[in-house]
Amino acid sequence: LEVQVPEDPVVALVGTDATLRCSFSPEPGFSLAQLNLIWQLTDTKQLVHSFTEGRDQGSAYANRTALFLDLLAQGNASLRLQRVRVADEGSFTCFVSIRDFGSAAVSLQVAAPYSKPSMTLEPNKDLRPGDTVTITCSSYRGYPEAEVFWQDGQGAPLTGNVTTSQMANEQGLFDVHSVLRVVLGANGTYSCLVRNPVLQQDAHGSITITPQRSPTGAVEVQVPEDPVVALVGTDATLRCSFSPEPGFSLAQLNLIWQLTDTKQLVHSFTEGRDQGSAYANRTALFLDLLAQGNASLRLQRVRVADEGSFTCFVSIRDFGSAAVSLQVAAPYSKPSMTLEPNKDLRPGDTVTITCSSYRGYPEAEVFWQDGQGAPLTGNVTTSQMANEQGLFDVHSVLRVVLGANGTYSCLVRNPVLQQDAHGSVTITGQPMTFPPE
């Protein structure tokens, strides 16, 4: 009995559900009463889930597995694994027995994205060119272990005195801390890239150090050079800092955040106290850090409409300002694929394949490709429509003449998150059966 599973590992994010695909070809007259299906861990042979004696025997794996019972009769023996954990990583074997017997193993690769690195500098006061400083880059709760790269403001690698440590927490997720010891030049940007090798995701943090004192008559206000990227619905920190002089007190401080283009007031701190949010009550200062020169703004429950430039004005005796850009993003959903017509297909037939992905931002890039990854640039029409929250739904239609058989894949790419959502449909010339979601 031929049992088919994917060649490539199934990659699943921690906390999401994964489908371990497995299929067989039922003969005419096949009934579920004849079927024995067993899923087990390949190495330890621990039972995961089984279907015997015509019924689902249930999960033997922390009650987190399920079969696609309504698809079993068509030969779909796939296993749904819920709330994936790091400990689930490994090989699962699908055993199918009817009259004959067959088995195949599928690998589950677990992954978790690393957080945007936070950067700290020690010492962080009274720096002069030639001083040695320690820059620490910390990124949290990723899997598997990260690769860490340091670079200057031009992207050139910094391969000097770097020490990187990675520690797994009780869920098996890694926190990474990388320390760069560097001798300061006149000024410089130091960036840390934390790469997840499975997700091919790069998390980026940077710090710009200007050792010489700012000229008198101006407060030097520092903000990140790169746009702050925030997911819709999450909180974002718009970083802004200044260097308080000895004897500085908050009574001397005037801090104003406003929208750069419209000059609309967002938040202010004047006359020694927080004047509160003037921006839909969704902003806050880090009041306990203000005296140390941290004028950053917390923006809660980010919306698409928040995207743009925010200016941080700081006035003590002197005055300074700088603008920071907020780039809003939302990941696109896994594309759903529809086929028209979807019955009695023959080579030479023209079909319309529609790929739909929802609630992303900004507008997506859509690519079609065949089963080998070669681009399909034929008759494609893509439309994107924003909903009332400004999130886009994308629909891309490919008209194609069928070959003997083929796989048609749609990649919906979020250009800001550099996230690719992938959907595919395989047409074999027989009546269609879609793979389960």
């Epitope: 790269f149 403001g153 690698p157 790069d202």
Partner: antibody
């Protein structure tokens, strides 16, 4: 569409200087660094250096320090490379090239200028 | 600096033939990048991060390797593949290229 349009061929005398331009369009100039690459006739590629248009920061190949100076003009989205004290060894095609990303490990150059041919001859 | 040595310097292949060229680094590098260049043209990105094909590159190309040893393979040579291929690293300064492998059609 991203484009990098370089200035035309140059014929200069030994000892002179030359300034090659690379005018960009189709993307935000300050969001990507700009690299310069030398290709001597029938030979391989040599990296000269890189400039960050956002703040003018530069990183050079030690071999070209003192030979090449990289600058930008943000208002016209143009990058420049000046080469000085020219000798016949500097005769080559010079390319400007934009990398895929500064914030990711994608260190490949996905857009290149058409090249500027420099001939140093008396 | 890291020296990249490409071999062979010159090779020829018939249509349909499998082709493999190598790039050896004098010190370990994290990732390798490859470019294709044809006469009187600028280089084109071909493979990034060791094994990923750049946009528009045919699926018959593949890249692999780690540490100091990397390779580019064409599963079935086609006429349009005749070109010079350069490897590139930027794991340490300065960024360096290999001397190139010139692939001709037999």
């Amino acid at each position: 569409e991203v484009q990098l349009q370089q200035s035309g061929p140059e014929l200069v005398k030994p000892g002179a200087s030359v300034k090659i331009s690379c005018k960009t369009s189709g993307y935000t100039f300050t969001e990507y660094t700009m690299h310069w690459v030398k290709q001597s006739h029938g030979k391989s590629l040599e990296w000269i250096g890189v400039i960050n248009p956002n703040n003018g920061g530069t990183t050079y190949n030690q071999k070209f320090k003192g030979k090449a100076t990289l600058t930008v003009d943000k208002s016209s989205s143009t990058a420049y490379m000046e080469l000085r004290s020219l000798t016949s060894e500097d005769s080559a095609v010079y390319y400007c090239a934009r990398p895929h990303s500064l914030l990711r490990l994608r260190r490949e150059f996905d857009y290149w200028g058409q090249g500027t041919t420099l001939t140093v001859s008396s | 600096q890291i020296v990249l040595t490409q071999s062979p310097a010159l090779m020829s292949a018939s249509p349909g033939e499998k082709v493999t060229m190598t790039c050896s680094a004098s010190s370990s590098v994290s990732y390798m990048y490859w470019y294709q260049q044809k006469p009187r043209s600028s280089p084109k990105p071909w493979i990034y991060l060791t094994s990923n094909l750049a946009s528009g590159v045919p699926a018959r190309f593949s890249g692999s390797g780690s540490g100091t040893s990397y390779s580019l393979t064409i599963s079935s040579m086609e006429a349009e593949d005749a070109a010079t291929y350069y490897c590139q690293q930027w794991s340490s300064n300065p960024l360096t290229f290999g001397a190139g492998t010139k692939l001709e059609l037999k």
